[in-house]
Structure formats: structure tokens, C-alpha cells
């Protein structure tokens, strides 16, 4: 069974996983550019179940698309640096799920765009840190 | 103890910028990620931003995007926040707080000719 | 944005009174909501995390209920030291908006 240090200690790094992804939609949201436009044209692979931890592979494994994608939105206007925010998310990915993890992830048949990619990872989040909390 | 110590008030003119700082003790500095509210006078609680203190990215407001900027010196384990071009009615007390249940004292900047 | 609205903006209570406090998200919010108590020249206090779990320190005649887009703060015995003003906070999603607060005053 977990301990209660583990447990904080996961939860915490879902709370910095969240925020981060939260914070590249909210750059998103707030991006007045006809690159917004653009970033909307790429497709993302979505989970066909995400429910735990070892799920987190379908979002390492597409977080090299996703640097891609923001590497689209720079400008002043846009705070978010990709590749240290990538490293950082890819960071915490690897900590929560486990780097030995054998997990094949599963994707859904259906693509999504880079907002809705970004929902249901920080969906995702939010519902483990309420099972935590 | 845990604790966030924020910079003295401040008086500015209009047009001008200001750069407020907020320092953390008794916790581990890049743990928790730093967000900036502000209070006008006789007024409710205002979201600026937020930033990691250690990646050193930020993510702003709509309303402030352009006129803000958030930035940290993990070697002072200080985040500092900037506001430019500086109107009266961003007269307000800017507070820092971490993980929310943490908060500085607040800083009263104001904003007159 | 998430539109988050309070009710009463004010009211008159006296000693050993029950308040509740009312918060509505303008869209579900699940249970992202946190309560904090603010009282002139300080900063605000986190009182209720989580919709209805309380922070350290803080006394047990203070509870939160609710999800999706209603929320109730309530107090069941109102001590002089918690005349203030409160209000209610979402982080479902940036940006994070607060309530318009509520004044508590001795009646």
C-alpha cells in the first residue's frame, strides 16, 4: 500500500503536471494570432482510456508533437518556452508513471485537436488528485 | 516557517512601471508554483498570473498579457513581478501567494500624478 | 472565462449565529473550489480546499459543501473573530476567477 509521503509526493507532481497543462491552454486561449489557426490544424492522438497512472505513456508519447505545435506559437505574447516546458512535463510523466512501465498505450480512433488534447490530459489530472485529496 | 515577504509600497506616475518582489522562506523554493493576485481599493480578488519557479515559465491573464511580466531567482529563492505602462486604476495592493495556502503580506502600489 | 457569483454580497449576522454563504459557477467546476476569509489590511486566508476540505488550522465551525456549480460555505456558530469578508475561488481552469465576496458584519 501506498504510504501517505508517497501519496503527497505523487499528488504533488499531478498538481505541477495540471498547472503546466493548464497553462499552455490558457497561452492558447489567449493567442490573438493567425497561428492559432494553424496550431488547430494539427492532430493529436487521444487516449482510448485514461483512468490511472501507467495511462500517462499516451501523453509522453505525444509530447514531442505538442512541442511542435507551441513551437508554432512563438512570440512575445506567447510565455511559454517549449522545449524547457516540454522537458519539465516529460520530467514529471516519466516520475508518476514509472520509467520501467511496459504499458502499450491504446489510442482512440478518433484525432483531436490541440485544445481538446490538452482538456482531456488536465481532465485526466484533476480526477486522480481528486481521488487523492 | 513557511513564509512570503513582498517588497515595500510603492508610489508610481502614470506611465511608469513597477516591479514588485516577493521572497520564500521555509519551504523548498521551486515546489510550488507562484501566483500573483491584486486588490483594488474596497474591491474583490483579481488573478494576474503564475509562474514556475523552476523552469522559470509564466502564464498571464488575458487582461494583463503584454503588460506583466513574471520572472524568479531560484538563487534567492524570489519570484518578482513587473507591470508596465502603469494607469490609475492599476492602484492596488499585489500579493504573491504559493499553493494558495501561503500568502505575502501584500504590497501596495499607487498609481497618481 | 469561469463567471463565479456570490450571494449575499452582505450580511448582518450576530454571535453564535449559523451563516451560509452561497458561490455559483457559471459552469461546472467539479469540486475546484476553495473558500478564503479576508479581513481589512491582510491578506486572505485559506479556510476550504477542495470544495469541503478544510485547511490546517482552521476551526471545525467552518465547512464547505458542493460540486459541479453550487457551492456552500458555512459557519455553524459565528465567533467575533469571524467577522470578515469571504470569498469563493475556482482553479478548474485559467484563468482562476474569484467571487465578487461576501462582507460578514455584527449585526
Known amino acids: 500500500a501506498p504510504t501517505s509521503s508517497s501519496t503527497k509526493k505523487t499528488q504533488l507532481q499531478l498538481e505541477h503536471l495540471l498547472l503546466d497543462l493548464q497553462m499552455i491552454l490558457n497561452g492558447i486561449n489567449n493567442y490573438k494570432n493567425p497561428k492559432l489557426t494553424r496550431m488547430l490544424t494539427f492532430k493529436f492522438y487521444m487516449p482510448k482510456k485514461a483512468t490511472e497512472l501507467k495511462h500517462l505513456q499516451c501523453l509522453e508519447e505525444e509530447l514531442k508533437p505538442l512541442e511542435e505545435v507551441l513551437n508554432l506559437a512563438q512570440s512575445k505574447n506567447f510565455h511559454l518556452r517549449p522545449r524547457d516546458l516540454i522537458s519539465n512535463i516529460n520530467v514529471i510523466v516519466l516520475e508518476l508513471k514509472g520509467s520501467e512501465t511496459t504499458f502499450m498505450c491504446e489510442y482512440a480512433d478518433e484525432t483531436a485537436t490541440i485544445v481538446e488534447f490538452l482538456n482531456r490530459w488536465i481532465t485526466f489530472c484533476q480526477s486522480i488528485i481528486s481521488t487523492l485529496t | 516557517q513557511v513564509q512570503l515577504v513582498q517588497s515595500g509600497a510603492e508610489v508610481k506616475k502614470p506611465g511608469a512601471s513597477v516591479k514588485v518582489s516577493c521572497k520564500a522562506s521555509?519551504?523548498?523554493?521551486?515546489?510550488?508554483?507562484m501566483h500573483w493576485v491584486r486588490q483594488a481599493p474596497g474591491q474583490g480578488l483579481e488573478w494576474m498570473g503564475i509562474i514556475n519557479p523552476r523552469a522559470g515559465y509564466t502564464s498571464y491573464a488575458l487582461k494583463f498579457q503584454g503588460r506583466v511580466t513574471m520572472t524568479r531567482d531560484t538563487s534567492t529563492s524570489t519570484v518578482y513581478m513587473e507591470l508596465s505602462s502603469l494607469r490609475s486604476e492599476d492602484t492596488a495592493v499585489y500579493y504573491c501567494t504559493s499553493g494558495w495556502d501561503v500568502w505575502g503580506q501584500g504590497t501596495l502600489v499607487t498609481v497618481s500624478s | 472565462d469561469i463567471q463565479m457569483t456570490q450571494s449575499p454580497s452582505s450580511l448582518s449576522a450576530s454571535v453564535g449565529d449559523r451563516v451560509t454563504i452561497t458561490c455559483r459557477a457559471s459552469?461546472?467546476?467539479?469540486?475546484?473550489l476553495a473558500w478564503y476569509q479576508q479581513k481589512p489590511g491582510k491578506a486572505p486566508k485559506l479556510l476550504i480546499y477542495a470544495a469541503s476540505s478544510l485547511d490546517s488550522g482552521v476551526p471545525s465551525r467552518f465547512s464547505g459543501s458542493g460540486s459541479g456549480t453550487d457551492f456552500t460555505l458555512t459557519i455553524s456558530s459565528l465567533q467575533p473573530e469571524d467577522f470578515a469578508t469571504y470569498y469563493c475561488q475556482q482553479s478548474y481552469s485559467f484563468p482562476v476567477t474569484f467571487g465578487q465576496g461576501t462582507k460578514v458584519e455584527i449585526k
Open positions: 521555509g519551504y523548498t523554493f521551486t515546489t510550488y508554483y
Open positions: 459552469q461546472s467546476i467539479s469540486t475546484w
